[in-house]
């Protein structure tokens, strides 16, 4: 799977899930975002070549069809699979509040 | 929605559904399809800017993190979102077959 | 360009045994059934013999009239198709046609081999 | 086996006339939406050319006077204009199972 556990821990070119770090305040302007300052939101991103983690029947045959015509401007994309969500702490008001944004962290990828 | 009802009549540069003919036999060299000689298959394709069709809060956030670090590799791909099966007819010997290959046709992008 | 060359007709005596040749070119043999159709004098034409690729592991069909005394065979390497006539009788005289079937019709044909079976 | 049957057996027509053959099966040669009829001009001296496939599908270099159609186990392969080079014997034939058979054929003559 082009998950954290392996592509964190090889240097693979092709589509696997990279890590980045981002920080609500610097990064995003979010300033209502009280813990956590920053988390590790990863991206996908890398070439998708022929059968690489396909996600449906077609990107297997877009992904031969760019195979085979490597000048088509058609090809798969390194896209998110698995995401989890991220629990913060923000005020409204006074009033602390607890929320769990879904799907904020990329653990694996797929060529779809 | 970015479907082929609005990017197929529409000069749109960011992320949009395109046409994509595919022959079985000479883009694929898929001999063993006789019906149909080829389909639309479609492709996803443009830029994915803040907000537009963000699948998940992740594609969100990546989109805007983007917007406000330009250089940062990291951002948003336009991909399928909705496919439609497609219906072939090959021959296993002499006995034919008809077979419908699930999420073949491209019908609508979004920014994942 | 497709080309299929049959080889092997004549004139033979009831009994007797021929083999009839087809040299293939112009398509990848391999992946294809070839297929013997016959036309008897003032008579349509007839599913004989037929054999599939490797792929789908050389089965055969022959027709009910020749059953059991024809054999078609074919020699990927060689791109050739044979039709084995053993007992043959004066009913099995025809024109045999070596043909291919990429899908269903018989989109190329060979020019035909006379066979004629009499004493 | 599917048995087919071809109608007329033969037939008299003069150039520029519209001919229609038909083939009726003995059990629907189609499958889903693909009909899998096929039609042949076999001439005299000659092997037997491809002219309709999957009952309406023009084969390579066949002219476009040439047109099928029809499902189930009724087909039918239409001559918008006769010409001189069309008087043949036509046949029909289907791939729904095997064995594969063949109509009894439709020979046209010149009137």
């Known amino acids: 799977a082009l998950d954290t556990n392996y592509c964190f821990r090889n240097l693979e070119e092709n589509c696997c899930v990279r890590p980045l770090y981002i920080d609500f305040r610097q990064d995003l302007g979010w300033k209502w975002v009280h813990e956590p300052k920053g988390y590790y939101a990863n991206f996908c991103s890398g070439p998708c070549p022929y059968l690489r983690s396909a996600d449906t029947t077609h990107s297997t045959v877009l992904g031969l069809y760019n195979t085979l015509n490597p000048e088509a401007s058609a090809s798969p994309c390194c896209v998110p699979q698995d995401l989890e969500p991220l629990t913060i702490l923000y005020y409204v008001g006074r009033t602390p509040k607890v929320e769990q944004l879904s799907n904020m962290v990329v653990k694996s990828c797929k060529c779809s | 929605a970015l479907d082929t009802n609005y990017c197929f009549r529409n000069l749109e540069e960011n992320c949009c559904v395109r046409p994509l003919y595919i022959d079985f036999r000479q883009d694929l060299g898929w001999k063993w399809v006789h019906e149909p000689k080829g389909y639309y298959a479609n492709f996803c394709s443009g830029p994915c800017p803040y907000l537009r069709s963000a699948d998940t809060t992740h594609s969100t956030v990546l989109g805007l993190y983007n917007t406000l670090n330009p250089e940062a590799s990291a951002s948003p791909c336009c991909v399928p979102q909705d496919l439609e099966p497609l219906t072939i007819l090959y021959y296993v010997g002499r006995t034919p077959k008809v077979e419908q290959l699930s999420n073949m046709v491209v019908k609508s992008c979004k920014c994942s | 360009e497709v080309q299929l060359l049959e080889s092997g007709g004549g004139l033979v005596q009831p009994g007797g045994s021929l083999r009839l040749s087809c040299a293939a070119s112009?398509?990848?043999?391999?992946?294809?059934?070839m297929s013997w159709v016959r036309q008897a004098p003032g008579k349509g034409l007839e599913l004989v013999a037929d054999?599939?690729?490797?792929?789908?592991?050389?089965?055969?069909y022959y027709s009910d009239s020749v059953k059991d005394r024809f054999t078609i065979s074919r020699d990927d390497s060689k791109s050739t198709v044979y039709l084995q006539m053993n007992s043959l009788r004066a009913e099995d005289t025809a024109v045999y046609y070596c043909?291919?079937?990429?899908?269903?019709?018989?989109?190329?044909w060979g020019q035909g081999t006379l066979v004629t079976v009499s004493s | 086996d599917i048995q087919m049957t071809q109608s007329p057996s033969s037939l008299s027509a003069s150039v520029g006339d519209r001919v229609t053959i038909t083939c009726r099966a003995s059990?629907?040669?189609?499958?889903?939406?693909?009909?899998?009829m096929h039609w042949y001009q076999h001439k005299p001296g000659k092997q037997p050319k491809l002219l309709i496939y999957?009952?309406?599908n023009l084969a390579s270099g066949i002219p476009s006077r040439f047109s099928g159609s029809g499902s189930g186990t009724d087909f039918t392969l239409t001559i918008s204009s006769l010409q001189p080079e069309d008087f043949a014997t036509y046949y029909c034939?289907?791939?729904?199972?095997?064995?594969?058979?063949f109509g009894g054929g439709t020979k046209v003559e010149i009137k």
């Open positions: 043909t291919v079937a990429p899908g269903g019709s018989f989109d190329y």
């Open positions: 112009g398509f990848d043999f391999n992946s294809y059934g």
């Open positions: 054999i599939v690729s490797k792929t789908y592991n050389y089965t055969t």
């Open positions: 059990q629907s040669v189609s499958i889903s939406r693909f009909n899998l």
């Open positions: 999957r009952a309406s």
């Open positions: 034939q289907h791939s729904r199972e095997s064995p594969w058979t």
